[in-house]
Amino acid sequence: EDELQVIQPEKSVSVAAGESATLRCAMTSLIPVGPIMWFRGAGAGRELIYNQKEGHFPRVTTVSELTKRNNLDFSISISNITPADAGTYYCVKFRKGSPDDVEFKSGAGTELSVRAKPSAPVVSGPAVRATPEHTVSFTCESHGFSPRDITLKWFKNGNELSDFQTNVDPAGDSVSYSIHSTARVVLTRGDVHSQVICEIAHITLQGDPLRGTANLSEAIRVPPTLEVTQQPMRAENQANVTCQVSNFYPRGLQLTWLENGNVSRTETASTLIENKDGTYNWMSWLLVNTCAHRDDVVLTCQVEHDGQQAVSKSYALEISAHQKEHGSDITHEAALAPTAPLGGSG
């Protein structure tokens, strides 16, 4: 009778994570007497996967009924495959012996590769906001996929970006892989409503890529523009000065009025007008009793936006000669009117 041969017909098998993997093995003979064992890997460090003789292998089932004498099929099925199960599996025939069974012949091995889906991409932006015309970095990360081949693209408002760098780790063989990509995006004033999208394509996704998004509203700061103007008044002893704060983002804004450098009033922006591009407008006014002033008044609108250094705009309010003559009798009193919204610009 010809010497026993161990036949593993498939060089490789690919299975999706969570499924069962069938590893095929056949013998040409039942001689010599002794058990069949399955191992992952070769050499001294190989891992026992199944032993016909003994042991408890809850994830392994034999494809055929091994207690039937004419059975030469020693294929096994491993349930609930994970990326950690990837490797080369060997079907090995042992000859009964002591103190240990003696390895008689091994199959050529079957490489099990596990197709594992990448995790949902997580996109994160810069830790601090930046202003238009500056470049900010966004990162995209996804983990746990296999095989290694993967495609990552970046988009801003549907337009593909080209300024990015991507790494897949580890560089060598592994049970699963991670991808990390950094994209550089130049901010524009209109980016409050913009989105960056990281798109990942992988064999396990069957043409339906995964996407992670980040809003540029989290990364951008649009500083306000200030305009101080005097509004016409019926009463000749009062002046109405407005400070128009325009096109800023985010909302956080504190405004201070100064008369000749002295703080007159501080207020926090509340009722804002939102522009179509996502920025905000706000207007504050100051009623000045001109009778209280003998000389011209410099009114300053000082704005602190989003914790940044204050910006200001001044307006010189001229006191007429007639008002100066009568002014000495007037008690110094600045009438401060409440703020009122100004129509939003679009």
């Epitope: 007497v33 002794g34 016909q52 003994e54 004419n70 009964k96 002591s98």
Partner: antibody, heavy 118, light 107 residues
Framework: EVQLVESGGGLVQPGGSLRLSCAAS????????MHWVRQAPGKGLEWVSA???????YYTGSVKGRFTISRENAKNSLYLQMNSLRADDTAVYYC????????????WGQGTMVTVSS | DIQMTQSPSSLSASVGDRVTITCRAS??????LAWFQQKPGKAPKSLIY???SLHSGVPSKFSGSGSGTDFTLTISSLQPEDFATYYC?????????FGQGTKLEIK
């Protein structure tokens, strides 16, 4: 049903011969290692002989050269030809099937009595 | 040849008792050890193979353990039908050899 039935036992004089038969049913005898085990009256079990699926044969020291194990696949039967019988060969002889992969005994016949006496 | 030694040679016990029979091999036999039960005038019955695996149809009150040279057979709760003679056997290499037997009797 898997079954082994021995026959051929009896009374024989010392130096005589006897041929034991074991008819197998419910399985193909040639696919298994097959054995003969004996038990002298009031004594324990003693393995006597075996034949492997490849036709390889094995014997215990005391019967070597006197006993021959064989099988006939067409009849699905196992045999033990016993020559030069001695008084200490007196025993119940059991036909036994070896297990699938490790040759552990799993199926036993009911036994046949061999008495060697003058 | 490999010698197999059983102890005790005989054992008296009561119904419901838990009993243990030991078997020692003269050399390492891996775990190629079987246990058999035999009742008077009957053929032996296979109980356990590879030291701890139960043959089909054998009740779980029978259990085996051991590897190398020392082995045990345990019957967890004796029933009247369990009183018999028990044999161990090594089948790692020819000639296969049996222990001398342990007779389990009702106390």
């Amino acid at each position: 049903e898997v079954q082994l039935v021995e026959s051929g036992g009896g009374l024989v004089q010392p130096g005589g011969s006897l041929r034991l038969s074991c008819a197998a049913s419910g399985f193909t005898l040639s696919s298994y290692d097959m054995h003969w085990v004996r038990q002298a009256p009031g004594k324990g079990l003693e393995w006597v002989s075996a034949i492997g699926t490849a036709g390889d044969t094995y014997y215990t020291g005391s019967v070597k050269g006197r006993f021959t194990i064989s099988r006939e696949n067409a009849k699905n039967s196992l045999y033990l030809q016993m020559n030069s019988l001695r008084a200490d060969d007196t025993a119940v002889y059991y036909c036994v099937r070896g297990g699938v992969w490790d040759d552990a005994f799993d199926i036993w016949g009911q036994g046949t009595m061999v008495t060697v006496s003058s | 040849d490999i010698q197999m030694t059983q102890s005790p040679s005989s054992l008296s016990a009561s119904v419901g008792d838990r009993v243990t029979i030991t078997c020692r091999a003269s050399q390492d036999i891996n775990n190629y050890l079987a246990w058999f039960q035999q009742k008077p005038g009957k053929a032996p019955k296979s109980l356990i193979y590879t030291a701890s695996s139960l043959h089909s149809g054998v009740p779980s009150k029978f259990s085996g353990s051991g590897s190398g040279t020392d082995f045990t057979l345990t019957i967890s709760s004796l029933q009247p039908e369990d009183f018999a003679t028990y044999y161990c056997q090594q089948y790692v290499s020819y000639p296969y050899t049996f222990g001398q037997g342990t007779k389990l009797e009702i106390k």
